[in-house]
Interface confidence: low
């Protein structure tokens, strides 16, 4: 159903070694950084905090799908994690490593 | 090529009277809002002022494209333009109606 | 199960050097981080220093050169050394496991220094 | 390098919720994370908050952290005070270069 479709926020863990992110971030192995995923149709809900960009960008898709692509369902806020990263050879705690996690989505 | 597909801003003009705003802005009767356009692949260029998290998204959706959607291209500067609209009847000029434009794109 | 045991004198004279090992088990010392913490009696904690997982140390400068930490790998142990003692090093020393947060503790051992 | 204030003691009885706190002398309290510790008469500490407000596996969802910037604070809630509540509360956080710094702790008595 399009309404489970719709733009939200879905887990998603990322394994440092994964990425090759090991190398350099000691700890912690991975942490749970989610993704935006869904659709961002007219009417854009409001807990989704529309710009009026996206609002008139999706009402001129709904009207004419050849004429504008749809809004997209991506991260508007995202969170810090702390880790303990090499920098020169050096462990060093980062207190607050930012814009890793995403805490809100959004349609823009 | 790639390169031609890659996140940018493109034109994208907006007719009032095509979304039914016409009915409330009195002018302009359309402005130029440009769009969004193209993918985001990693390596995300500085330019597009990826965040930590759409690096990091983009990296995964390169290694395993079934784990992680891609990162989106998406409106990351939003201009004002000036209209004239009815407000309760009454001819109202608003000389900045925010978030109208888009001005910069970016992979989030 | 993942332990921490703190070993050494209950009693140092002053000027004297003190000597604790910290013997981990259920973890790896080249996984996890070790804090040393101290806490004189009726007080509260002091952060000494810590052996990083990669070899790493990192000391409060307020012990400045006296202290030094250590550690064998392959018997899972952690050494704090440190050196001219006096009266205020009275005090209760904690090795403590640093993961993401710390979340192990050893039990302490009280060293007193008096003569 | 700052100094982490908290008071030496609180009273408060069973069942009701108190807020002990935690101030930074000097820069921003937001700019690293703050840990909470309850230490029982005796005992060895445990973690009750890490980065700010999250709670370990274990740890009652009674325990909350938060930070105040405009009183430059960090702020432990415990709700539903149990007798078992009563000890000494450490907050701790950062200087920078790594330098793990501790308030003096809070005793909290449960009435």
């Known amino acids: 159903n399009a309404k489970g479709n719709y733009c939200k926020r879905t887990p998603l863990y990322i394994d440092f070694k994964e990425i090759g992110w090991d190398s350099w971030i000691i700890a912690p192995p991975g942490y749970e950084a989610y993704e935006c995923r869904g659709v961002c149709n007219y009417p854009l809900a409001e807990h989704l905090t529309p710009t009026k960009h996206a609002i008139i960008q999706a009402l001129v898709h709904l009207k004419n799908s050849q004429k504008a692509s749809k809004a997209c369902c991506v991260p508007t806020k995202l969170e810090p994690i702390s880790i303990l990263y090499l920098d020169k050879g050096v462990v060093t705690y980062k207190f607050k490593y930012e814009g890793m996690a995403v805490s809100e989505c959004g349609c823009r | 090529n790639a390169k031609g597909n890659y996140c940018k801003r493109t034109p994208l003009y907006i007719d009032f009277k095509e979304i039914g705003w016409d009915s409330w802005i009195i002018a302009p009767p359309g402005y130029e809002a440009y769009e969004c356009r193209g993918v985001c692949n990693y390596p995300l260029a500085e330019h597009l002022t990826p965040t930590k998290h759409a690096i990091i998204q983009a990296l995964v959706h390169l290694k395993n494209s079934q784990k992680a959607s891609k990162a989106c291209c998406v409106p990351t500067k939003l201009e004002p333009i000036s209209i004239l609209y009815l407000d309760k009847g009454v001819v109202t000029y608003k000389f900045k109606y925010e978030g109208m434009a888009v001005s910069e794109c970016g992979c989030r | 199960q993942v332990q921490l045991k703190e070993t050494g004198p209950d009693l140092v004279q002053p000027t004297q050097t003190l000597d604790i090992t910290c013997t981990v088990s259920?973890?790896?010392?080249?996984?996890?981080?070790v804090h040393w913490v101290r806490q004189p009696p009726g007080k509260g904690l002091e952060w000494m220093g810590t052996?990083?997982?990669?070899?790493?140390?990192d000391y409060n400068s307020a012990f400045k050169s006296r202290l030094a930490i250590s550690r064998d790998t392959s018997k899972s142990e952690v050494f704090l050394k440190m050196d001219s003692l006096q009266t205020d090093d009275t005090a209760k020393y904690f090795c403590?496991?640093?993961?993401?947060?710390?979340?192990?503790w050893g039990q302490g051992i009280m060293v007193t220094v008096s003569s | 390098q700052f100094v982490l204030i908290q008071s030496d003691s609180m009273s408060t009885s069973a069942g009701s919720t108190v807020k002990l706190s935690c101030k930074r002398s000097?820069?921003?309290?937001?700019?690293?994370?703050v840990y909470w510790y309850q230490q029982h008469e005796g005992r060895s500490p445990t973690t009750m908050i890490y980065?700010?407000?999250?709670?370990p596996d274990g740890v009652p969802d009674r325990f909350s952290g938060s930070i105040d910037s405009s009183s430059n604070s960090a702020f432990l809630t415990i709700n539903d005070v149990q007798i078992e509540d009563e000890a000494v509360y450490f907050c701790?956080?950062?200087?920078?270069?790594?330098?793990?710094?501790f308030g003096g702790g809070t005793k909290l008595t449960v009435l």
């Open positions: 403590a496991r640093l993961g993401y947060y710390v979340d192990y």
């Open positions: 259920g973890f790896s010392l080249t996984t996890y981080n």
């Open positions: 052996m990083w997982n990669g070899g790493g140390i």
């Open positions: 000097t820069g921003n309290i937001g700019s690293s994370y």
């Open positions: 980065d700010g407000d999250k709670r």
């Open positions: 701790q956080s950062f200087s920078s270069g790594i330098k793990f710094i």
